[in-house]
């Protein structure tokens, strides 16, 4: 004759996640849950994240009876309240000789003359503030600019008339313009001297420079 199987509430234990079963009646039981779990069989992990302590935009990640903070890259520590020193982590954070300065929640670059941008990678367009004479072409350089003059103009800003236009140098001499004052400079061929290379040279000197 078969015997009815006897129901024992705690055998096997219905409590999960390490909960301890206690029989409370013939057909009833109670689970004593480990910290961090709840429910009649301890099946639910309690969410520890409500009103969490992760700061500076840290994201709460629930654990068992605890939580972790996932921090933005510029913060670290248990609650994302420790500043990351980006200048140590990224030695080349600032380019072109810029100096890295760590700040709370980030960093900044102090750029050398002629460079700008968050990482000092942008060459400042010096032509934006240049005063090359209209008609000339501005060429941007690092922390400076130069003006390319049209024919007939001279000087650093192309604001002077080119004295060489009138061919003041004679006898095949080379004519250059002084960029500061616009005056011509004649480089005389062998045998000639003078401001415009019109004088004969008695002694055997080679080239003579004359400014005018």
């Amino acid at each position: 004759a078969g015997s009815d199987s006897l129901y024992v509430p705690c055998a096997p234990s219905p409590c999960v996640n390490g909960g301890t079963c206690r029989q409370t009646g013939d057909f009833t039981f109670e689970c004593n849950c480990l910290p961090g779990f709840e429910g009649s069989t301890c099946e639910r992990n309690i969410d520890d994240c409500p009103n969490h302590r992760c700061q500076n935009g840290g994201v709460c990640v629930d654990g068992v009876n605890t939580y972790n903070c996932r921090c933005p890259p510029q913060w670290t520590g248990q609650f994302c309240t420790e500043d990351v020193d980006e200048c140590l982590l990224q030695p080349n954070a600032c380019q072109n000789g810029g100096t890295c300065a760590n700040r709370n929640g980030g960093y900044g670059c102090v750029c050398v003359n002629g460079w700008s941008g968050d990482d000092c990678s942008e060459n400042i367009d010096d032509c934006a503030f240049a005063s090359c004479t209209p008609g000339s072409t501005c060429i941007d350089r690092v922390a400076s600019f130069s003006c390319m003059c049209p024919e007939g103009k001279a000087g650093l800003l192309c604001h002077l008339d080119d004295a060489c236009i009138s061919n003041p140098c004679h006898k095949g001499a080379l004519c250059d313009t002084n960029p500061l004052n616009g005056q011509y400079i004649c480089t005389c061929p062998q045998g000639y001297k003078g401001a415009d290379c019109t004088e004969d040279v008695d002694e055997g000197n080679s080239h003579h420079h004359h400014h005018h």
Epitope: N51, R53, V64, N68, F79, T81, E82
Partner: antibody, heavy 117, light 112 residues
Framework: EVQLVQSGAEVKKPGESLKISCKGS????????IHWVRQMPGKGPEWTGY????????KFNEKFKGQATISVDKSSTTAYLQWSSLKASDTAMYYC??????????WGQGTLVTVSS | DIVMTQSPDSLAVSLGERATINCRSS???????????LHWYQQKPGQPPKLLIY???NRFSGVPDRFSGSGSGTDFTLTISSLQAEDVAVYYC?????????FGGGTKVEIK
């Protein structure tokens, strides 16, 4: 420079209400929780609870739940600790604090609350 | 709550001598993230506590190197290698691994 400046000392009678303040400056106020820490005469500090300025959410030490409330005014970057009915056992120094490298890295100067009939 | 037990309650040390303070927790302070959130504070009369050491052994900015921290799990030590007159204070350990944060009872350091 991070600074937490608290309101002055208070002497109250049992049953009276009280609101003490903590003004934060030198940092982004809404990015950090403000803690309140109690220190009874001759004893060690005890963490009471904190408020999240951004949301106004609070978390308390179970030991202090229901005894006081914590609030915040973001516009004036000020946190408050308030009692509706003081008891003699509330006599203590109350500090506000902010996290940094460790828990409670930056502290206010403290507010002494004396409750006596 | 985690109970933090400090010893001794008070300590008298000669100037220039070593002072050692112990702190024991009722449970391991190793967090699930692998770090141990045990910190040390100094409190002088009429002042708020001041952070000295965070996460067992990291000196907070401006803290003299005569202060050092060590330990693991449940047992931790704060050492003042050469006591100075300005070190007279009460020292507290604090754990923030488990909710809620709990302080030790304090150790009073005096000059012998």
């Amino acid at each position: 420079e991070v600074q937490l400046v608290q309101s002055g000392a208070e002497v109250k009678k049992p049953g009276e209400s009280l609101k003490i303040s903590c003004k934060g400056s030198g940092y982004t106020f809404s990015n950090y929780v403000i803690h309140w820490v109690r220190q009874m005469p001759g004893k060690g500090p005890e963490w009471t609870g904190y408020i999240i300025p951004g949301s106004g959410g609070t978390k308390f030490n179970e030991k202090f739940k229901g005894q006081a409330t914590i609030s915040v005014d973001k516009s004036s970057t000020t946190a408050y600790l308030q009692w509706s009915s003081l008891k003699a056992s509330d006599t203590a120094m109350y500090y506000c604090a902010r996290d940094g490298a460790g828990s409670f890295t930056y502290w206010g100067q403290g507010t002494l609350v004396t409750v006596s009939s | 709550d985690i109970v933090m037990t400090q010893s001794p309650d008070s300590l008298a040390v000669s100037l220039g001598e070593r002072a050692t303070i112990n702190c024991r927790s009722s449970q391991s302070l190793v967090h699930s993230d692998g770090n141990t959130y045990l910190h040390w504070y100094q409190q002088k009369p009429g002042q708020p506590p001041k952070l000295l050491i965070y996460r067992i052994s990291n000196r907070f900015s401006g803290v003299p190197d005569r202060f050092s921290g060590s330990g693991s799990g449940t047992d931790f030590t704060l050492t003042i290698s050469s006591l100075q007159a300005e070190d007279v204070a009460v020292y507290y350990c604090l754990q923030s691994t488990h909710f809620p944060d709990t302080f030790g009872g304090g150790t009073k350091v005096e000059i012998k």
